[in-house]
């Protein structure tokens, strides 16, 4: 039985040429995390990280995803076009699949404010 | 340049184990995993599992848990793989493989090192 | 385990030809997908990685294509050298799996 939650940062918002922290939390559960996948909104994998291989980043965003910090993802050098869903998909023994998703809205404007609260989506 | 040199071929018989050695040279050894990909006589790749030489710590395919061991000696920059209780379908070449930096792709091997289990 | 289903086993073809080998994978793994070729006797050497990227120094001739579930790798002008076995291999999720391999002859 899946008793875990998946906690994020859930919708947030940074400013073009900037970096933002996607990170997900998995909580009431005892399983082990074996791999989190980061995807993006058109399923396109930015990342992979094993729990023993470490990270795994895809070429299409080397030079501007950063691993962690934690499970967690760095996207760095923002432009309009990374304004969408963010999904973590967590891989667990002996629960199974978790997924947590995050909306990530790149502003134009300077006083953009990077939300870092945590919620269940 | 990067090398991965394996140790030689080997015959055993049902129910032994084997280690195989795989040295390296020309890269930070600590910072790639290593991984251990098999190969029957004219037959398909297997993916046995990997090891992080930084942590030691390691995934294995399911299909051998139990039965396999992956280790490394960070002072001669050397990974092991140790398979027990060997049958004749282990009679395959064992190939190691390192990981491209942050990618989960083989970019070099060792030359492979034959089993052979016979009775 | 996600199965990779590799056709066809092997194909002959001739100097110059177009060659085109599918893989098939049993779930959705993204781009997470790399080609290998082989040749007799030795370690396999990567040619494409990330479904579509060609590894340093692999020539033009060889590409990559496809998402999801299915996969595919073209020699757009086959060479002599290219005779070996080619294999494609997921890395979605552990384990990670090959396909059955492809053999590439001369005609």
């Known amino acids: 039985m899946m008793t875990g939650t998946i906690e994020t940062t859930g919708n947030i918002s940074a400013k073009k040429g900037g970096s933002v922290i996607l990170q997900c939390h998995l909580s009431s559960t005892m399983a082990q995390v074996t791999q989190v996948n980061w995807e993006q909104h058109d399923h396109s994998l930015l990342a992979i990280r094993n729990a023993e291989l470490g990270w795994h980043i895809y070429p299409a965003f080397k030079d501007r995803v950063a691993p962690g910090p934690g499970l967690g993802l760095t996207l760095q050098s923002l432009t309009m076009n990374d304004t969408g869903e963010y999904f973590c998909t967590y891989h667990t023994y002996p629960d199974g699949t978790y997924r947590g998703r995050i909306f990530l809205e790149v502003l134009e404007s300077s006083v953009a404010e990077h939300s870092a609260r945590f919620q269940i989506p | 340049q990067v090398q991965l040199v394996q140790s030689g071929a080997e015959v055993k018989k049902p129910g032994a184990s084997v280690k195989v050695s795989c040295k390296t040279s020309?890269?930070?050894?600590?910072?790639?995993?290593m991984h251990w990909v098999r190969q029957a006589p004219g037959k398909g790749l297997e993916w046995m599992g990997g090891i992080n030489p930084n942590t030691g710590g390691t995934t294995y395919n399911q299909k051998f848990q139990g039965r396999v061991t992956l280790t490394v000696d960070k002072s001669s920059s050397t990974a092991y793989m140790e398979l027990s209780s060997l049958r004749s379908e282990d009679t395959v070449v064992y190939y190691c493989?390192?990981?491209?930096?942050?990618?989960?792709?083989?970019?070099?091997w060792g030359q492979g090192t034959l089993v052979t289990v016979s009775s | 385990d996600i199965q990779m289903t590799q056709s066809p086993s092997s194909l002959s073809a001739s100097v110059g030809d177009r060659v085109t080998i599918t893989c098939q994978a049993s779930q959705d793994v993204r781009t997470a997908v790399a080609w290998y070729q082989q040749k007799p006797g030795k370690a396999p050497k990567l040619l494409i990685y990330s479904a579509s990227y060609r590894y340093t120094g692999v020539p033009s001739r060889f590409s990559g294509s496809g998402s999801g579930t299915d996969f595919t790798f073209t020699i757009s002008s086959l060479q002599p050298e290219d005779i070996a076995t080619y294999y494609c291999h997921q890395h979605y999720i552990t384990p990670w799996t090959f396909g059955g391999g492809t053999k590439v002859e001369i005609k």
């Open positions: 020309g890269y930070a050894f600590t910072e790639y995993t």
């Open positions: 493989a390192k990981l491209l930096r942050l990618m989960y792709y083989f970019d070099y």
